[in-house]
């Protein structure tokens, strides 16, 4: 069977006026996953995003991440889009320096 990912979105200061938003997916199986940032509902181009490898996390499941740099104050226009085993979920950017975990249920 499949194990849905835990998705976690965080933000960190980049340069002045910019922040880096990172979306991490962990504890999922099988390893095939789509993880991408969307702006105003549409996927960003590949050259504006950085991806981590899909790696084993030691429990028979996998983890990966995607990040992009955006203008501070525009965070609400962005969502992390996750697709795994025919299911999808969207994960907004939290305000301030907080972070939030979403568990995606199949």
């Amino acid at each position: 069977g499949s194990v849905p990912p835990m998705v976690n979105v965080t933000r960190s200061e980049a340069s002045e006026g910019n922040i880096t938003v990172t979306c991490r997916a962990s504890s999922f199986y099988p390893r095939n996953i789509t993880l991408t940032w969307r702006q105003d509902g549409v996927s960003l181009s590949h050259d504006t995003q950085q991806w981590g490898d899909v790696l084993p996390d030691g429990n028979g499941t996998y983890q990966t991440w995607v990040a992009t740099r955006i203008c501070q104050g525009e965070e609400q226009r962005f969502t992390c889009y996750m697709e795994h085993s025919g299911n999808h979920s969207t994960h907004p950017v939290p305000s301030g320096n907080s972070h939030h975990h979403h568990h995606h249920h199949h």
Epitope: V42, E83, P92
Partner: antibody, heavy 117, light 107 residues
């Protein structure tokens, strides 16, 4: 102009199924998620689920997971919502809407589904 | 699931009145809140998104505020076409949930 045009009203028997269509125009259909919401007579709004028309991947409200099936046909720019094992409580207006980032910006006109024996 | 509670459930007001509707979330939804207006037999119409951003074509008498768990929709000077039902909706996490609605009626 973005438009979502839904199929016409339906009258169904308890235990049967209904399939509502939502034809999109005026934008790139596969770029945006399509959401489904229902509203029982005189009641509030309830989210059913969403589909990515590009990939077919879905996200369901747990309440509807066992009875709702969302699909999309890229060749006709049409999304579908099928609800099975209908009961009287499913009598409602069913809406499709486009997900623009983090809100629904355009809605279909609604489809009334009446479940009656 | 995040519960959205709107108040009041209905109100009576006159043209020109200032009207305020509140929406409270059962958890932190940051600023991921939208307000819709719905008239009988019609689909909801987007008024405000991200808690305070006015949607295209919406008159400036409508405004939204709040973040976290408490939000407000204000109509600064009620017009005849504003008599309708208003809903809030959270977009922080699925299932996306709506408030139960506030019906604005003519006094």
């Amino acid at each position: 102009e973005v438009q979502l045009v839904q199929s016409g009203a339906e009258v169904k028997k308890p235990g049967s199924s209904v399939k509502v269509s939502c034809k999109a125009s005026g934008y790139a259909f596969t770029n945006y998620l399509i959401e489904w919401v229902r509203q029982a007579p005189g009641q509030g709004l309830e989210w059913i689920g969403a589909i990515n028309p590009g990939s077919g991947a879905t996200n369901y409200n747990e309440k509807f997971k066992d009875r709702a099936t969302l699909t999309a046909d890229k060749s006709t720019n049409t999304a579908y919502m099928e609800l099975s094992s209908l009961r009287s409580e499913d009598t409602a207006v069913y809406f499709c809407a486009r997900f623009l980032g983090n809100y629904f910006d355009n809605w279909g006109q609604g489809t009334l589904v009446t479940v009656s024996s | 699931d995040i519960q959205m509670t709107q108040s009041p459930s209905s109100l009576s007001a006159s043209v020109g009145d200032r009207v305020t509707i509140t929406c409270r979330a059962s958890g932190n939804i940051h600023s991921y809140l939208a307000w819709y207006q719905q008239k009988p037999g019609k689909a909801p119409k987007l008024l405000i998104y991200y808690a305070e951003t006015l949607a295209d074509g919406v008159p400036s008498r409508f405004s939204g505020s709040g973040s976290g768990t408490d939000f407000t929709l204000t109509i600064s000077s009620l017009q005849p076409e504003d008599f309708a039902t208003y809903y809030c909706q959270q977009f922080w996490t699925t299932p996306y949930t709506f408030g139960q609605g506030t019906k604005v009626e003519i006094k």
